[in-house]
């Protein structure tokens, strides 16, 4: 039985050249967790796995930390970026939770003027 | 080439104990999680039990829960199954799978497996 | 723990025949569906992970398709050595569950 819940950052905006941390959070449930996919529609970018630690996909490894905590950082934005991101929890005993975050890379003068999206 | 190779099957009575090993080579053992997964004669697949690359979590469905313990000895890329209380349900043939480290319920190589058969 | 359900259980195919095989989830398991195969007397071999991703050294002639509780798997030309029973696996929650297997034979 899937009691829990994944919280994420929502829709967020972050400016060309900068960075951005990418988090979610599993609540309302004792189950263990895992490992912590993070992906950008299908491409892997990251794991965070409970015996191993962090693995950065080679790809990403000039652009991409870990952390804080369970998130991820990427840097060096460009308009690229923009897109759908997920965070997936492995966890037991109830399985698989996936939580979404779409990110707006905007030009730094669009950005400057204010983000079209606020974190909830 | 990753290769998986089973042992220690055979004839058991029922209440009897026994322990399957899986000897494993072509891949750095110790960073993938590894299940044993049986099929009864004629009949399909269970899952049976997975363990994490470093040995710190274990889980099991309800039908091994107690009598099945599934460990590993990374130092000598060895895979093992106890299994304690044999009923004539579990006879099967039982294989040792490698897990793919994205995605930890995948089953991506399969050993060819060892028959264990629970008979008075 | 999450039923899968297969059909058909056996089909009857020639060579070239386009043929489809469904696998069904007692709940919502998202994308996370494997596809395998396995022949008379060997080991299963992973086919499809994440209901539509080819695995590694798989023919493009297998896909995968669907999401949520309805799966499909097709091999769009059938060939000599996809003569084999498939079978599916859910990778949404424990206990990880297979579905009873589809045996594909030659017509």
């Known amino acids: 039985m899937m009691t829990g819940t994944i919280e994420t950052t929502g829709n967020i905006s972050a400016e060309k050249g900068g960075s951005i941390i990418l988090q979610c959070h599993l609540s309302s449930t004792t189950a263990q967790v895992t490992q912590v996919n993070w992906e950008q529609q299908d491409q892997l970018l990251a794991i965070c796995n409970a015996d191993l630690g962090w693995h950065i996909s080679p790809s990403f490894k000039d652009r991409v930390a870990p952390g804080p905590g369970l998130g991820l950082t990427l840097q060096s934005l460009t308009v690229n970026d923009t897109g759908e991101y997920f965070c997936i929890y492995h966890t037991y005993p109830d399985g698989t939770y996936t939580g979404r975050i779409f990110l707006e890379v905007l030009e730094s003068s669009v950005a400057e003027h204010g983000a079209r999206f606020q974190i909830p | 080439e990753v290769k998986l190779v089973e042992s220690g099957g055979g004839l058991v009575q029922p209440g009897g104990s026994l322990r399957l090993s899986c000897a494993a080579s072509?891949?750095?053992?110790?960073?993938?999680?590894m299940s044993w997964v049986r099929q009864a004669p004629g009949k399909g697949l269970e899952w049976v039990a997975v363990i994490s690359s470093g040995g710190s979590y274990t889980f099991y469905p309800d039908s091994v829960k107690g009598r099945f313990t599934i460990s590993r000895d990374n130092s000598k890329n060895t895979l093992y199954l106890q299994m304690n209380s044999l009923r004539a349900e579990d006879t099967a043939l039982y294989f040792c799978?490698?897990?793919?480290?994205?995605?930890?319920?995948?089953?991506?190589?399969w050993g060819q497996g060892t028959l264990v058969t629970v008979s008075s | 723990a999450i039923q899968m359900t297969q059909s058909p259980s056996s089909l009857s195919a020639s060579v070239g025949d386009r043929v489809t095989i469904t696998c069904q989830a007692s709940q919502n398991i998202n994308v996370w569906l494997s596809w395998y195969q396995q022949k008379p007397g060997k080991a299963p071999k992973l086919l499809i992970y994440k209901a539509s991703t080819l695995a590694s050294g798989v023919p493009s002639r297998f896909s995968g398709s669907g999401s949520g509780t309805d799966f499909t798997l097709t091999i769009s030309s059938l060939q000599p050595d996809d003569f084999a029973t498939y079978y599916c696996?859910?990778?949404?929650?424990?206990?990880?569950?297979f579905g009873g297997g589809t045996k594909v034979e030659i017509k």
């Open positions: 799978t490698r897990q793919d480290y994205r995605y930890p319920y995948i089953m991506d190589y």
């Open positions: 072509g891949f750095a053992f110790s960073s993938f999680d």
């Open positions: 696996q859910q990778g949404q929650s424990y206990p990880w569950t």
